[in-house]
């Protein structure tokens, strides 16, 4: 007996769609072998109509597809625009059509229910609004107008022009009679329920001269849209519920095993803690549509999601909804990268951000997730070099190591830097990822002066002490600007007094500016790296003043002043907008930091092709 299983009988009506699921044992051979859907002919042969290798027969072109879900051991055949010619006997199977791994499926497509002549069909999703049009003749204009629902052989009054409203339709139905000259009345039913489904009769007048019109109302529960995303990636649910609910609170919820729907996020400020740091509800457009972005997808995020509108910010029967079935593919194209990066106060972190390697030219961004209200993510830095003002001198986005990964370095860490950050590009939105920065106890590994004042025209020597564990790393000094950090020549000066336990392995790398010019003012970073992977960094600010005393100046950590005060971000941070899905620059109004001079000028600055290290970068 074949191990393939599916529906034995599928019945539908003309114009409809079917979605036929076939199940197979998910062995490695079965998962990767050809899947097919074929029609059995009179000769007994089974002619392929669609297969997992991309084949689609001519009479299925544009209306059918086959999707394999290998980790679940299922494949799905979707067929749209059914006609009665599609009725017949089919097989869904694996491998070759003539071999045994298949299951017989009978498909029957009928004409649909016989409706009285002239019946108007209204097909509407549950929770939405329908307007039933009811024409009448002039002589019935002054007479009673009514709408009945046919239940079996009887007709039940739903509403009439004498102000009667059936209790089942209370507060959600209205009958509109137009001004003179218009020979049509309308009945509007809001917040449709599944129980509203059925045949209705409009009536104007009574006796043999009455006007009648039949209406067939089909109320559909929205079929969930299948959404298939990669583990660690991102999903966007676009929710368009119509203008009728434009001003009503919106929500996204996930259906649980008890069949209720747990709010994931809503516009009233509620958010499920399981999505902390990785969810945003984009403010709605004028038409009431909105979207929800979830990053850092986990296997446990799988399930059925509903978006909807209701004043309580949660699911209520009879209000409009949209549905999705989210699958999270464990065979992900998105590489593993740490979801938590730890740093110490005063230290630094180097965060690796994945992006779609096919989009190496895309703009790269890094933003700070803020949980207030619906969540927002103001941009902090982008690959074109724009940096939020308060991050001046301590944040840089580097294109390295490249080939699907960029690096973000943040130094001078404080406890206020703890939080969730998103890596994103202006390309493939599914590659958005989330990283949490945690500030832990400890001392920075690199030691530099806090603040240095250099004298114009003289020599400045800035030391950077590093411990023995970095002895095999490449050390560098660079001058920070809002477009990156340009490497400068530096020299290794041998043992350092700063780390007494490490003897000759504890070393010092120094930056010498000779002679100091006005252009030298600004932020300098001392750092370590291995190839294109960056490790820790330490920042020092150099101020330049007029000559007061002759002679060169050597700064030791004992003479270092406190770092300059951070500039505070002004208020103009905009919340993420729908457009930001296409253009993440709209996550925030960027504050552009003025470029700080000519990268230390002349022959004294050698430009390295920037570079990156493992996630983290704190004293262990």
């Amino acid at each position: 007996k074949s191990p393939v299983f599916g529906p034995q009988e599928v019945s539908s009506v003309e114009g409809n769609s079917v979605s036929i699921k076939c199940y197979y044992p998910p062995t490695s051979v079965n998962r990767h072998t050809r899947k097919y859907w074929c029609r059995k002919g009179a000769s007994g042969r089974c002619i392929t109509l669609v297969s997992s290798e991309g084949y689609v027969s001519s009479n299925y072109a544009g209306r059918a597809n086959l999707t394999n879900f290998p980790e679940n051991g299922t494949f799905v055949v979707n067929i749209a625009q059914l006609s009665r010619d599609d009725s017949g006997h089919y097989k869904c199977g694996l491998g070759i059509n003539s071999r045994g791994l298949s299951f017989d499926v009978s498909l029957e497509v009928s004409q649909g229910p016989e409706l009285p002549n002239g019946t108007e069909v209204y097909t509407v999703d549950v929770g939405r609004t329908v307007t039933i049009k009811c024409p009448f003749k002039t002589e019935n204009a002054p007479k009673t107008k009514a709408l009945y629902k046919k239940i079996g052989q009887t007709s039940v009054l739903v509403i009439d022009s004498r102000n009667y409203v059936n209790p089942n339709y209370k507060d959600r139905i209205r009958l509109r009679i137009p001004g003179t000259g218009q020979l049509i009345f309308t009945v509007v039913i809001d917040r449709l329920r599944l129980s509203d489904h059925g045949l209705y009769l409009c009536q104007a007048g009574d006796g043999s001269n009455r006007d009648e019109k039949n209406a067939d109302l089909q109320v559909l529960e929205p079929e969930p849209e299948l959404v298939y995303e990669d583990l660690r990636g991102s999903v966007t649910f676009h929710c368009a519920l119509g203008l009728e609910v434009a001003n009503v609170a919106k929500f996204l919820c996930r259906v649980n095993s008890r069949e209720t729907c747990d709010v994931v996020i809503n516009t009233l400020g509620k958010r499920d803690s399981a999505f902390e740091g990785r969810i945003l509800l984009n403010p709605q457009d004028k038409d009431g549509s909105f979207s929800v972005v979830i990053t850092g997808l986990r296997k446990e995020d799988e399930g059925r999601y509903l978006c909807g509108a209701h004043s309580d910010g949660q699911l209520q029967e009879g209000w409009p909804i949209q549905a999705w079935q989210l699958f999270v593919n464990e065979e992900s194209t998105i590489p593993r990268s740490p979801t938590v990066v730890k740093g110490v106060a005063g230290g630094s972190v180097a965060v690796l951000c994945p992006y779609n390697p096919k989009e190496s030219q895309s703009l790269k961004y890094w933003c700070l997730w803020e949980g207030a209200q619906n969540g927002r993510c103001p941009l902090l830095v982008e690959s074109q070099g724009l940096v939020q003002e308060q991050y001046e001198g301590r944040l840089s986005l580097l294109q390295e190591p490249g080939n699907g990964t960029f690096t973000v370095i943040l130094n001078q860490l404080t406890t206020q830097d703890a939080g969730f950050y998103w890596c994103l590009t202006n390309g493939d939105t599914r590659w958005r990822t989330t990283v949490e920065i945690k500030i832990i106890e400890g001392e920075p590994n690199l030691k530099v002066p806090g603040n240095v004042t250099a004298v114009l025209g003289e020599t400045l020597n800035i030391p950077c002490h590093f411990p023995c564990k970095f002895s095999s790393y490449e050390k560098y000094w660079c001058k920070w600007s809002n477009t990156g950090c340009q490497t400068l020549p530096s020299q290794d000066e041998g043992p350092s007094e700063a780390f007494v336990n490490c003897d000759e392995n504890s070393r010092l790398v120094s930056l010498t500016l000779n002679p100091v010019t006005r252009a030298d003012e600004g932020w300098y970073w001392c750092g370590v790296k291995q190839g294109h992977f960056y490790g820790e960094t330490a920042a020092v600010y150099v101020a330049v003043e007029e000559k007061k005393v002759a002679g060169s100046r050597y700064v030791s950590p004992a003479k270092a002043d406190a770092a300059p005060d951070e500039k505070v971000l002004d208020s103009g941070v905009r919340e993420i907008e729908n457009k930001a899905i296409q253009d993440p620059r709209l996550f925030a109004e960027e504050k552009v930091v003025a470029d700080t001079g000519d990268q230390a000028g002349g022959s004294r600055a050698s430009v390295d092709s920037s570079s990156s290290e493992e996630q983290g970068g704190s004293s262990k």
């Epitope: 299983f5 529906p7 034995q8 009988e9 539908s12 009506v13 679940n72 559909l220 029967e317 549905a323």
Partner: nanobody, 130 residues
Framework: EVQLVESGGGLVQTGGSLRLSCAAS????????MGWFRQAPGKEREFVAA??????????YVGGSVQGRFTISRDAAGNTVYLQMNSVKPEDTAVYYC?????????????????????WGKGTQVTVSS
Amino acid sequence: EVQLVESGGGLVQTGGSLRLSCAASGRTFSPYAMGWFRQAPGKEREFVAAIRWSGATTYKYVGGSVQGRFTISRDAAGNTVYLQMNSVKPEDTAVYYCAADRVPKDISIDPRNPKDWDYWGKGTQVTVSS
């Protein structure tokens, strides 16, 4: 909460027929799928048949051991499901349980797996005598 109530069980002769019914109540909306499982003494619960619907489209699933003998159907309102049992055999003797599902779940959900059904009836005994 959804309540499922089975009826129609009883004693039937080999080769005879029986029709089981299962009525769902307690919710204002219809279930998405309903099915039948059976359990003979000392054995695991076994899939018999299931019916799933979406608008005017219906999908019927039948377990291998009853194929060609048992059929599943439902009433127009979608709240009652029937199992027509023809050509019954002594090995069909078991407690027959009705199951229902309100939520169209993930693509991996297999109607044959009892764990994937949310609601269950208390069962009705079917005994086939030889």
